[in-house]
Interface confidence: medium
C-alpha cells in the first residue's frame, strides 16, 4: 500500500561534508516498527546509501560502519549523512516502510538534491 513521504528539495552539505534533512511520512496506521532507507540516484542508477529499522519512540540504529545517523520523532525522521565529497552530489531519496503491524505500507519521497562542495585547500602561510 502506498504512503506519502515528504522531504526537502535541496540541501547543501556543510564544509565538513555533512548534510542533514528531514524525511516525513503520513502514517495511515499505528506502526510500531518502521524501516527507513536512503537511496542515491545518479545517472539513472539507484544505490542504497544506508538503512535502519526502529521501533517507534526509539533511536534509529544504523550499522556501525554506516555514513548515516538519525533520530525519530513521531512521523519524522531526521537524517544526517556524513563524509560526503563533491563527487557524492546527487539526489538522495527517502524510502519509508511501515513494517508492523500489518498492513504493510511503503512510501518513497521525491528526493533531496544534496550539493557537496569540496573545501578549498588552505594556502600555505609564509
Amino acid at each position: 500500500k502506498a504512503m506519502h513521504v515528504a522531504q526537502p528539495a535541496v540541501v547543501l552539505a556543510n564544509s565538513r561534508g555533512t548534510a542533514s534533512f528531514v524525511c516525513e511520512y503520513a502514517s495511515p496506521g499505528k506502526a510500531t516498527e518502521v524501516r527507513v532507507t536512503v537511496l542515491r540516484q545518479a545517472d539513472s542508477q539507484v544505490t542504497e546509501v544506508c538503512a535502519a529499522t526502529y521501533m517507534m519512540g526509539n533511536e534509529l540504529t544504523f550499522l556501525d560502519d554506516s555514513i548515516c545517523t538519525g533520530t525519530s520523532s513521531g512521523n519524522q525522521v531526521n537524517l544526517t549523512i556524513q563524509g560526503l565529497r563533491a563527487m557524492d552530489t546527487g539526489l538522495y531519496i527517502c524510502k519509508v516502510e511501515l513494517m508492523y503491524p500489518p498492513p504493510y505500507y511503503m512510501g518513497i519521497g521525491n528526493g533531496t538534491q544534496i550539493y557537496v562542495i569540496d573545501p578549498e585547500p588552505c594556502p600555505d602561510s609564509d
Partner: antibody, heavy 122, light 111 residues
Framework: QVQLQQPGSELVRPGASVKLSCKAS????????VHWVKQRPGQGLEWIGN????????NYDEKFISKATLTVDTSSSAAYMQLNSLTSEDSAVYYC???????????????WGRGTSVTVSS | DIVLTQSPASLVVSLGQRATISCRAS??????????MHWYQQKPGQPPKLLIY???NLESGVPARFSGSGSGTDFTLNVHPVEEEDAATYYC?????????FGGGTKLEIK
Amino acid sequence: QVQLQQPGSELVRPGASVKLSCKASGYTFTNYWVHWVKQRPGQGLEWIGNIFPGSDTSNYDEKFISKATLTVDTSSSAAYMQLNSLTSEDSAVYYCARLAYFTNYGGAMDYWGRGTSVTVSS
Amino acid sequence: DIVLTQSPASLVVSLGQRATISCRASKSVSTSAYNYMHWYQQKPGQPPKLLIYLASNLESGVPARFSGSGSGTDFTLNVHPVEEEDAATYYCQLSRELPYTFGGGTKLEIK
C-alpha cells in the same frame, strides 16, 4: 538470555475470570510485541492476539475479542491476558510468545513461554 | 481470514529417510520481497520452537537437516535425514496479515 515466564497452572470456576501473566526478561520489553496463543488438549495452535508494550497497541482475532483482554505493565516487564466468563471450552494451555523484529524475521515468534494450563471446572 | 491446510495430518518415516510436510494457504502469503510463512516444532508438554522463518531461513541453533521452501500459497518443510529426536508435531504459521493463523499440525513419528 531471553525468557518468558508463565505460571504452570490455574484452576478456575465456570463463569469466573482469570488473569494470566507472562514475565519477560533478558531483552528490552518495550521493543517487542507479545503474542498469546491457545492450545486445547490434543489440538492445534490458535492465535488470540498481540500487544506492543511500547505503546499499548493491541490486535485480537475476532473470535477472542469478547473473551480476552491484553494488557502490559512496563515497570515489571510483564504482559497479561485476562479471560472472562470462562467455560469448559476455555480449558487449554495458553502460551505467550515474543515476536522477533518483523524486518528480520517477517513475523515469526522466536521465544515462547512454557505455557499456563487453565482448567475450568466446578 | 487466510486458512492454512497442512498435510498429511500424521506421518511415519523411517530413521534416516526424508519427511515432507506440506502447508497450503487459501490465498497468497507472499509479496515481491518475502514469503511470510514460518515453521515450528512442538514436542509433548513443551512450547512450540521456531525452526524456519520466512519460508526458507533456518533459525539459529536448528540442525541443517531441516529446510523450508515455497512461495505464494504452497510451502514445504523437509526433514532429512530424520532422527529419533525429530518425533514431534509440526505447525506452519502465516504472518502476511492479521489475524495470524496456524496450520492444523502434522504429527511426525519415527520408526
